[in-house]
Interface confidence: medium
């Protein structure tokens, strides 16, 4: 299953399959997730080691047993790959690293006014993988405001150095935020020239394209079909690049197929997995396990559940079958692709779905062993769980926020439905940033069921929580995916990085905002909160957040929306925007429903009709 916990001051011994430099443990974990063989990783922050060569070292590891011995190492961080973690699998990494210079091949330099603009330039440059920006206070005046666009053979920095007044980060192309746009066309009987960066075997051009999309240096590809004249080159997928970013030439060639990486697509990227099953095809590779199962789909499920399995072949040969069950060969290779592809066999083959980010039809939880006032504009895909709950009577208007917690489930505040309990009048918009983008043609979800907490009473602050079951499940994308829920009774975690988002009022007597707003707000202890709300009862089922001096808060129209906190690189839904005295008033924190206290209720209500809990637990 999915394991999300990080181990502080621990280093996995042995099992190395690759190493690189990464700016933090979360980026290291992402690289492990996308590496075909990596199950575990260990990261050495700059503070953890004196050896300059090993600072920022990210060590990717494999293990036949799925685990490795841990040794104590002060400052080190270790953890698991997020393979099998559904919607948490993403190559998108938005963080900016202050005081850090990520080294690589500098191929472009320009003057910009902010690190955000530098990141945007990198995202809009086809070859840029990461960047460094010298701030206005950089010690050498001639380098100030320089934006250096960079790449490297592996897509990660060739070195990382601590350097004051420098900020670094990665391209947001994997976040589907590139302005470049992409070529979806597949060109039959055409071969591209230029530099080959890798060679893998694939059953078709579509798998070849997906591999190209997620390869750090692949910009385009050529695939040789299974009837290509040279037998040794059949099913070869050549991943390519060029100085210009486009093929310098193309040659008409029978039984070849060419195309482009889809990394520069805007708003939608292919999933980093291959779900198609190929009948009459055998995939060769290192044998991991052989098991008897009933049907090719069960074989694929078995491969997906066995974390080291990369691909499989289900044999229908009489000698490989017993009654209704046949042999399911679970296999792997060094690069994640078959080492041999044979056609005209009595088998069916396919790939593990361990990197598919759709996950199952469930809500997500984690186990570990009212516009925003004073906020700023959000960007695309920054809060992909945020939804807008709108009411359509004569006119249509935004009333509340909500959080997507599963394909078919939204969590919000019960008070949003005060006086409006009819499900037919509600429209739920997901995957949006600007309310003005909503037109009569914009798709929306309708409500199948509104489940208000049984102890909620209108005009009272208690048990202000409701679940919405959508009529149809939503697909996950970079812009529309769920937020993980905390563990039941989560009281030990100290959250220091918390944000509230919504389209609500920007001041007490304001109006709904067009662009989704975000504000970073510190949590306040319940004791402190109680002092400020002396005639209200602040219960353990509530959590408060706000600044002593006021000025930043949720407000009308943000109700029901998320209070999310980032912990160990993972966002969790800590609170639901509920109530407060006015907005952003001095010493009057916002009060939120504490989600951890309602985990039993959420689990009970999101049980499927067959009684199976619809919970996806990454731990």
């Amino acid at each position: 299953g999915c394991l999300t916990q990080l181990y502080e001051n621990a280093f996995f011994r042995g099992g190395d399959v690759a190493s690189m430099y990464t700016p933090n443990a979360q980026y290291c974990q992402m690289r492990c997730t996308f590496h075909p063989r990596c199950l575990l990783f260990s990261f050495l922050p700059a503070s953890s080691i004196n050896d300059m060569e090993k600072r920022f070292g990210c060590f990717l590891k494999d293990s036949v047993t799925g685990t490795l011995p841990k040794v104590h190492r002060t400052g080190a961080v270790s953890g698991h790959s997020l393979k099998q973690c559904g919607h948490q699998i993403s190559a998108c990494h938005r963080d900016i690293y202050k005081g850090v210079d990520m080294r690589g091949v500098n191929f472009n330099v320009s003057k910009v006014s902010s690190v955000e603009e530098c990141q945007k330039r990198c995202t809009s440059n086809i070859r840029c993988q990461f960047f460094s920006y010298a701030t206005q206070t950089f010690h050498k005046a001639e380098y100030r405001n320089n934006c250096l666009l960079k790449y490297s053979p592996g897509g990660t920095p060739t070195a990382i150095k601590v350097l004051s007044n420098v900020e670094s980060g990665f391209s947001l192309k994997p976040c589907a935020l590139s302005e470049i746009g992409c070529h979806m066309n597949i060109f039959q009987h055409l071969a591209f020239s230029d530099v080959d960066v890798a060679r893998v075997l694939t059953p078709d051009a579509f798998v070849c394209r997906t591999i190209c999309t997620y390869h750090p240096n692949c910009l385009f590809f050529t695939f040789y079909t299974n009837v290509w004249k040279i037998e040794s080159q059949r099913n070869v997928c050549l991943l390519k690049t060029s100085e210009s970013g486009t093929p310098s030439s193309s040659t008409p060639q029978e039984n070849t197929i060419s195309g482009y990486s889809l990394l520069t697509c805007k708003r939608t990227l292919p999933e980093p997995c291959h779900s198609k099953i190929y009948p009459g095809v055998d995939f060769g590779g290192e044998e991991l396990n052989v098991t008897f199962v009933k049907g090719v789909n069960v074989c694929q499920e078995t491969c997906t559940k066995m974390i080291r399995c990369q691909f499989f072949t289900y044999s229908l040969l009489p000698e490989d079958c017993k009654e209704e069950k046949c042999k399911c060969f679970l296999r792997l290779s060094m690069d994640g692709s078959p080492t041999r592809i044979a056609y005209g066999t009595q088998g069916s083959s396919g790939y593990s779905l361990r990197l598919c980010n759709t996950g199952d039809n469930s809500v997500c939880t984690t186990k570990t062993s009212t516009r925003i006032v004073g906020g700023t504009n959000s960007s695309w895909g920054e809060w992909p769980w945020q939804v807008s709950l709108q009411v359509k009577l004569t006119a249509q208007r935004h009333l509340c926020g909500g959080s997507l917690i599963g394909h078919q489930w939204v969590l919000t505040a019960a008070h949003c439905f005060d006086g409006l309990p009819l499900q037919d009048v509600w429209r739920i918009y997901s995957g949006i940033l600007n309310l003005s983008d909503i037109t009569k043609d914009t798709p929306f979800s309708q409500i199948k069921e509104i489940i208000i907490h049984q102890n909620y009473k209108v005009s009272e602050g208690n048990h202000d929580i409701a679940l919405i079951k959508l009529q149809a499940p939503l697909n996950y994308t970079e812009f529309q995916k769920p937020i993980c829920l905390p563990s039941k009774g989560d009281t030990s975690t100290i959250y220091t990085n918390c944000w509230v988002t919504g389209w609500g009022f920007s001041k007490e007597k304001g109006e709904i905002q067009n662009i989704l707003q975000k504000v970073n707000i510190p949590l306040v202890t319940n004791e402190e909160c109680q002092k400020r709300y002396q005639d209200y009862k602040i219960t353990q089922r509530m959590v408060c957040a706000g600044y002593k001096e006021g000025g930043k808060d949720a407000c009308k129209g943000d109700s029901g929306g998320p209070l999310v906190c980032k912990h160990n690189g993972m966002w969790r839904l800590v609170g639901i925007t509920s109530w407060g005295e006015g907005c952003a008033r001095r010493e009057q924190p916002g009060v939120y429903t504490k989600v951890a206290e309602y985990m039993d209720w959420i689990l009970e209500k999101t049980q499927s009709s067959d009684g199976k809990a619809q919970m996806q637990s990454p731990a």
Epitope: E460, Q534, D535, Y536, E581, E587
Partner: antibody
């Protein structure tokens, strides 16, 4: 609809004790704080104390410490105010009020007259 | 303890006229002041909280203002049903009521 129903007027002798009640309807007292407020004839309002009926936690204004005892009975959705060692200074109308909105809901008041 | 000094203690005004009551706190109360109307035989009625925020259903002739330790409450056009005693309440630190202002018709 939220309502607070207080017990009837009391005539008591100096030195005696009296126990007033306030029963809530339309809400559960466990979910909020309940307050008692005093108003002496021709004088202003004074906050006596606050109780959390769920756990019995009480906060008194220091000048009522020892004079007033606030209790709650969640099964009947009722809070009580007991006044001890009564003197003429305790002659007043006593109001119960519901928290969660700056004393937005009040009982009708109970007149306590201390007289020999 | 925060003390609230309310003035005047009584006030005679004409119907249709304007009425202003003030409350002075013994320290800065950060705008955490509420105003109540109290009629005989009833519980007090909350009119305004956080200095100037009118409760739902309260007529707009009632208003409040102030900051720091000085606050005021006004009725712009006195109506017969406004005859009552008015109290301020600080809720910055626990609760303290002002002494009240008895409003009568001239």
């Amino acid at each position: 609809e939220v309502q607070l129903q207080q017990s009837g007027a009391e005539l008591v002798k100096p030195g005696a004790s009296v126990k007033l009640s306030c029963t809530g309807s339309g809400f559960n007292i466990k979910d909020i704080y309940m307050f008692w407020v005093k108003q002496r004839p021709e004088q202003g309002l004074e906050w006596i104390g606050r109780i959390d009926p769920e756990n019995g936690n009480i906060k008194y204004d220091p000048k009522f410490q020892g004079k007033a005892t606030i209790t709650a009975e969640t099964s009947s959705n009722t809070v009580y105010l007991q006044l001890n060692s009564l003197t003429s200074e305790d002659t007043a109308v006593y109001y119960c009020s519901r928290g969660g909105g700056l004393f937005a809901y009040w009982g009708q008041g109970t007149l306590v007259t201390v007289s020999a | 303890d925060i003390q609230m000094t309310q003035s005047p203690s009584s006030l005679s005004a004409s119907l249709g006229g304007k009425v202003t009551i003030t409350c002075k706190a013994s320290q800065d109360i950060n705008k955490y002041i509420a105003w109540y109307q109290h009629k005989p035989g009833k519980g007090p009625r909350l009119l305004i909280h956080y200095t100037s925020t009118l409760q739902p259903g309260i007529p707009s002739r009632f208003s409040g203002s102030g900051s720091g330790s000085d606050y005021s409450f006004s009725i712009s056009t006195l109506e017969p049903e406004d005859i009552a005693t008015y109290y301020c309440l600080q809720y910055d630190d626990l609760w303290t009521f002002g002494g009240g202002t008895k409003l009568e018709i001239k």
